[in-house]
């Protein structure tokens, strides 16, 4: 299709524009330009004819316009008038017209911007500023930039009058920047000098430092004052309240107990006209003192409080240390130190937290070791547990439970008999129980300072005659060659005996049986599908014995590698072919068959009436068992010959 | 001054055939386009064939492709028309045309007087 | 192809009336369309070409309009010469004209 691509698109004033024709059409006649978007005699620019190599202007010929022989357009010395449409008309060697329109967009050039401003000095918090970036120029896009990045999303950041204007309400500090204007059309793109906007701010609250407060005798006292500030702050001491000096910093040499007391660093600003103080006390020891640990919590809870231990006093120029448990601190990212390891901060403390923990302050000949302090952990309480683990009691024996929780403080427990709460102690002794005694036992723990309970439920069942046991299984269908499974005789009863038998026989010697846990336990290896049989279990003690239900063991296997029956490859045409497949597979597996790699039916018999010799080819089985994600094929050949061509071939079903 | 005059008109029976000329002077006729237009007895104007000042492109109306020939001798600024399997629906006046040399949508600027062709038994 | 249809067919007018003549294309021809004069035992004669365009040497009275399919040649005070046959054609291909308008004095 007959295009017309501008080049440029967008012309700068003064410059050129080349309308180029493409997909311009073989054999013409001729072509001729338009200005518009449609062919108008009265605005044609310049008609060109290829027989004779004649360009002829039109009534909007200007002189600037150039036409080459591949049709494309050149006008020159652009001016804002020549923005718009131009339609370029094609008449083909048959007379068959064609026309397409192109355009472009004169702009002009923009000259380099500059920025007003209407504050040269504001306040910080007070005053607001507007930057203007000039020159106004029609059809031009302003921007702006801060520090050399785009503007930041900002409340007081604020564009208006076309983008041009830019102000910032609420001046802070932080506005102190390089600030340009760009000026952008489709042609051209220019930036201003930078701006910098000198806020005046503080002075903000001054800081002191060092920071420690605590001092030797003899030692060099030397202070430091800083304000933020804008212009920078004048400052000034007083110490006890008597000025001193008007100097930033404040230098005391050889100082003894005397020269402790309050020190005051006052900031001023004279553009401003803000005064700001700040006092610290200094505490000069005559002798190092003994460090001590303060914690910011005495009784954290266990998972959900942090525990900060800070080493006191602080002294300047001295190094800090700490041993837990009598050790040197253990890598752990729960522990933190500070920067000065003055404070010492446990993430989420555990029971195992407790200590206990001692800091130190090195001098000169000595470390100085403070009394060791234990973290009191509150923690709890556990699941109880209950014990002995028996649940099958004789009648006439004492019954004597014991019941404990992990806790701190130390829980306080109940048993419940059925509901019914029964005493306030960790042991339920009952001597000469009865049948009448059984029930559910329940222990409750509970932690007073947490008001947190746990509690744990045991069947205690008294009876003459052992209980007819069941068997537990850890996995019902385990699969073959790849599971294990662990048959578990229930209950656990007090002085009993327990045994297994395998369809009815007692256990085989394999190296994939093993019991455990008083024989209670029978765990197969890497079943098998001989594995697959009845399990009993029993249990019995001087007057009784009882057998569980048996059970039998589902293994799922296969699918092994199938069989395709009849085993017959070679048919004669005519016969019919019934092809069976089996593949032995727990579950039962799904089928399917492909002929020659296409596939044909999901059953497990492939029947064909009346073969013929097209019917040759590769019959494959496929099996699979969705349960042990199994696959399996099996592939057969098939001849099918012409009726009576060779003797011995099957005649079909 | 632009002149074209058509001859070769005549009677002529069904079936028959006829050769139209038409002398082109005062432009030149090598580098124009030409083309024949016809005109039944009171009735409008049909355009019926054109061709490239080269002889390489030529069109011609449904109504007689396959029948009529447009030819051209640029030596002789001459243009053809050779009509065979004339019918009586072919009777009519014959103009020669020219289409001007400047490119715009074809138009044909300069007509010949005409010549009658009557197709009858 | 395609058909060219102009209304009127006839039209009776007076010396100094302003006269329009449409041409309708049964699909859109752009501005590919020329407009003609033909008077009796004359060859036509080319008054407005390209839809609008008037050709050199042809009366400022007459006027052309129209793109796509819809076209008007305009008279826009009628002389007594300017009485006869006019014709519309499409540009494309083929040349078709219309079945024209006799504008006869009234």
């Known amino acids: 299709k007959l295009t017309i691509e501008s080049t440029p698109f967008n012309v700068a004033e003064g410059k050129e524009v080349l309308l180029l024709v493409h997909n311009l059409p073989q054999h013409l006649f001729g072509y001729s330009w338009y200005k518009g978007e449609r062919v108008d005699g009265n605005r044609q620019i310049i008609g060109y004819v290829i027989g004779t190599q004649q360009a002829t202007p039109g009534p909007a010929y200007s002189g600037r316009e150039i036409i080459y022989p591949n049709a494309s357009l050149l006008i020159q010395n652009i001016i804002q008038n020549d923005t718009g449409f131009y339609t370029l008309h094609v008449i083909k060697s048959d007379l068959v017209n064609e026309e397409a329109t192109g355009q472009f967009r004169v702009y002009p050039e923009l000259p380099k911007p500059s920025i007003s401003s209407n504050n040269s000095k504001p306040v910080e918090d007070k005053d607001a500023v507007a930057f203007t970036c000039e020159p106004e120029t029609q059809d031009a896009t302003y921007l702006w930039w801060v520090n050399n990045q785009s503007l930041p999303v900002s409340p007081r950041l604020q564009l208006s009058n076309g983008n041009r204007t830019l102000t910032l309400f609420n001046v802070t500090r932080n506005d102190t920047a390089s600030y340009k204007c760009e000026t952008q059309n489709p042609v051209s793109a220019r930036r201003s000098d930078s701006v910098i906007l000198n806020v005046l701010y503080g002075p903000d609250a001054p800081t002191i430092s060092p920071l420690n407060t605590s001092y030797r005798s003899g030692e060099n006292l030397n202070l430091s004052c800083h304000a933020a500030s804008n212009p920078p702050a004048q400052y000034s001491w007083f110490v006890n309240g008597t000025f001193q000096q008007s100097t930033q910093e404040l230098f005391i040499p050889n100082i003894t107990v005397n020269n402790s007391g309050s020190y005051t660093c006052q900031a001023h600003n004279s553009d401003t006209g803000l005064n700001r103080t700040t006092v610290t006390t200094i505490t000069v020891y005559a002798e190092p003192p003994k460090p001590f640990i303060t914690s910011n919590n005495s009784n954290p809870v266990e998972d959900e409080d942090a525990v900060a231990l800070t080493c006191e006093p602080e002294i300047q120029n001295t190094t800090y240390l700490w041993w837990v448990n009598n050790q040197s601190l253990p890598v752990s990212p729960r522990l933190q130190l500070s920067n000065d390891n003055r404070t010492l901060t446990l993430l989420s403390v555990t029971r195992n937290d407790v200590g206990p923990y001692e800091c130190g302050i090195q001098n000169e000949l000595s470390v100085d070791h403070s009394d060791p302090v234990i973290l009191n952990v509150l923690y709890g309480p556990d699941d109880p547990t209950i014990s002995p683990s028996y649940t099958y009691y004789r009648p006439g024996v004492n019954l004597s439970l014991s019941c404990h929780a992990a806790s701190n403080p130390p829980a306080q427990y109940s048993w419940l008999i059925d509901g019914n709460i029964q005493q306030h102690t960790q042991e339920l002794f009952i001597s000469n129980i009865t049948e009448k005694n059984s029930g559910l036992y329940t222990c409750q723990a509970n932690n007073s300072a947490s008001g947190h309970s746990r509690t744990t439920v045991k069947t205690i069942t008294v009876s003459a005659e052992l209980p007819k046991p069941s068997i537990s299984s850890n996995n019902s269908k385990p699969v073959e060659d790849k599971d294990a499974v662990a048959f578990t005789c229930e209950p656990e009863a007090q002085n009993t005996t327990y045994l297994w038998w395998v369809n009815g026989q007692s256990l085989p010697v394999s190296p994939r049986l093993q019991l455990s846990n008083g024989n209670r336990t029978l765990t197969l290896f890497n079943v098998t599908r001989n594995d697959a049989r009845a399990y009993v279990c029993g249990i019995q003690n001087s007057v009784s014995a009882n057998r569980s239900d048996p059970v039998t063991l589902d293994v799922l296997y296969g699918p092994d590698t199938p069989i395709i029956s009849p085993p017959d490859s070679s048919y004669l045409s005519g016969a019919n072919l019934n092809l069976s497949c089996h593949s032995a597979s727990n579950p039962s597996p799904q089928y399917s068959w492909r002929i020659n790699g296409i596939p044909q039916q999901h059953t497990q018999v492939l029947f064909i009436a009346k073969i013929t010799p097209n019917n040759n080819g590769t019959y494959a089985c496929f099996v699979s068992n969705l349960a042990t994600g199994r696959n399996n094929s099996i592939v057969k050949s098939i001849t099918v010959s012409a009726s009576g061509t060779s003797p011995g071939l099957s005649a079909g079903a | 001054e632009v002149q074209l005059l058509e001859s070769g008109g005549g009677l002529v029976q069904p079936g028959g055939s006829l050769r139209l000329s038409c002398a082109a002077s005062g432009f030149t006729f090598s580098s124009s386009y030409m083309g024949w237009v016809r005109q039944a007895p009171g009735k409008g104007l049909e355009w019926v064939s054109s061709?490239?000042?080269?002889?390489?492109?030529?069109s011609y109306a449904d109504s007689v492709k396959g029948r009529f020939t447009i030819s051209r001798d640029n030596s002789k600024n001459t243009l053809y028309l050779q009509m065979n399997s004339l019918r009586a629906e072919d009777t009519a006046v014959y103009y020669c045309a020219r289409y001007p040399s400047v490119p715009f949508p074809p138009l044909l600027d300069y007509w010949g007087q005409g010549t009658l062709v009557t197709v009858s038994s | 192809d395609i058909q060219m249809t102009q209304s009127p067919s006839s039209l009776s007018a007076s010396v100094g009336d302003r006269v329009t003549i449409t041409c309708r294309a049964s699909?859109?021809?752009?501005?590919?369309l020329n407009w003609y004069q033909q008077k009796p035992g004359k060859a036509p004669k080319l008054l407005i070409y390209a839809a609008s365009s008037l050709q050199s040497g042809v009366p400022s009275r007459f006027s052309g309009s129209g793109s796509g399919t819809d076209f008007t040649l305009t008279i826009s005070s009628l002389q007594p010469e300017d009485f006869a046959t006019y014709y519309c054609?499409?540009?494309?291909?083929?040349?078709?004209f219309g079945q024209g308008t006799k504008l006869e004095i009234k």
């Open positions: 699909q859109s021809i752009s501005s590919y």
């Open positions: 054609q499409q540009a494309g291909n083929p040349h078709t």
């Open positions: 061709i490239g000042s080269g002889s390489y492109s030529t």
